[in-house]
């Protein structure tokens, strides 16, 4: 038995996780660069 609502929900969740992870990496990189420049 397979139901699309679980795949839709899980794909949406994982995309949000990936975006959050990417943003955290970018912001973390910028912060480190700022500290380094000081």
């Amino acid at each position: 038995h397979s139901d699309g609502i679980f795949t839709d929900s899980y794909s949406r969740y994982r995309k949000q996780m990936a975006v959050k992870k990417y943003l955290a990496a970018v912001l973390g990189k910028r912060y480190k660069q700022r500290v380094k420049n000081k």
Epitope: F6, S9, Y10, Y13, M17, K20, K21
Partner: antibody
């Protein structure tokens, strides 16, 4: 669409404490280009469900439950449409039915792992 | 790590009665609504009933209803049938960056008289 599980065995894969075992899950009926998260869940006899971890079939990115602590490893073979769970340093407490699931949507029938001396 | 506390652990209901299962999460599930409910019968893998706290899977009878948000969730079975005798589990999706991605509730055994 279905998930076929191998390793261990529906009738019971018997492993000695300290031993290792690889469980695999083959997806069939999917588009070869489709990517998804293959997750693994276990259930000790008479107990509840316990999340182990997930692997993304596209990039191979993984997430594990904190209790796994390096004891188990997830891998995938895109060409074979297969995801595997390597179980190491097994103890009696790892005796359980191990399920693979695609996005918590489609589930494999489970494979029983029995750890006993 | 996060904890999903499911209550009660077992419940008995007469045919036609109502069953309420609670799932309390600490911390909140991601986006306040990423919680699913599963039904499991002996010797079978779990079957998805409800996703996103309240969205019913296709083929699941309308007597099953999911509600709640954030930390408190409920699965209600109205007009219980013999076929509903099973174990029920909630599954939370969390912020993987700060904790485990997922956790299951301890389960609730539903006995139908």
């Amino acid at each position: 669409q279905q998930l076929e599980q191998s390793g261990g065995g529906a009738e019971g894969g018997l492993v000695k404490p300290g031993g290792s075992l690889e469980l695999c899950c083959k997806a069939s009926g999917f588009s070869l280009s489709s990517t998804y998260w293959m997750c693994w869940v276990r259930q000790a006899p008479g107990k509840g469900l316990e999340w182990i971890g997930c692997i993304y079939t596209g990039s191979g990115s993984t997430d594990y439950a904190s209790w796994v602590n390096g004891q188990f490893t997830l891998s995938r073979d895109i060409d074979q449409s297969t995801g595997c769970l390597q179980l190491n340093s097994l103890t009696v407490a790892d005796t359980a039915m191990y399920y693979c699931t695609k996005n918590f949507d489609l589930w494999g029938p489970g494979t029983l792992v029995t750890v006993s001396s | 790590a996060q904890v999903l506390t499911q209550t009660p652990s077992s419940v008995s209901a007469a045919v036609g009665g109502t069953v309420t299962i609670n799932c309390q999460s600490s911390p909140s599930v991601y986006s306040n609504n990423y919680l699913s409910w599963f039904q499991q019968k002996p010797g079978q893998p779990p079957k998805g009933l409800i996703a996103d706290a309240s969205t019913l899977a296709s083929g699941v009878p309308s007597r099953f209803k999911g509600s709640g948000s954030g930390t408190q969730f409920t699965l209600t079975i109205s007009g219980v049938q013999c076929d509903d005798a099973a174990a029920y589990y909630c599954l939370g999706y969390y912020d993987c960056g700060s904790t485990d991605c997922h956790a299951f509730g301890g389960g609730t055994e539903v006995v139908v008289k």
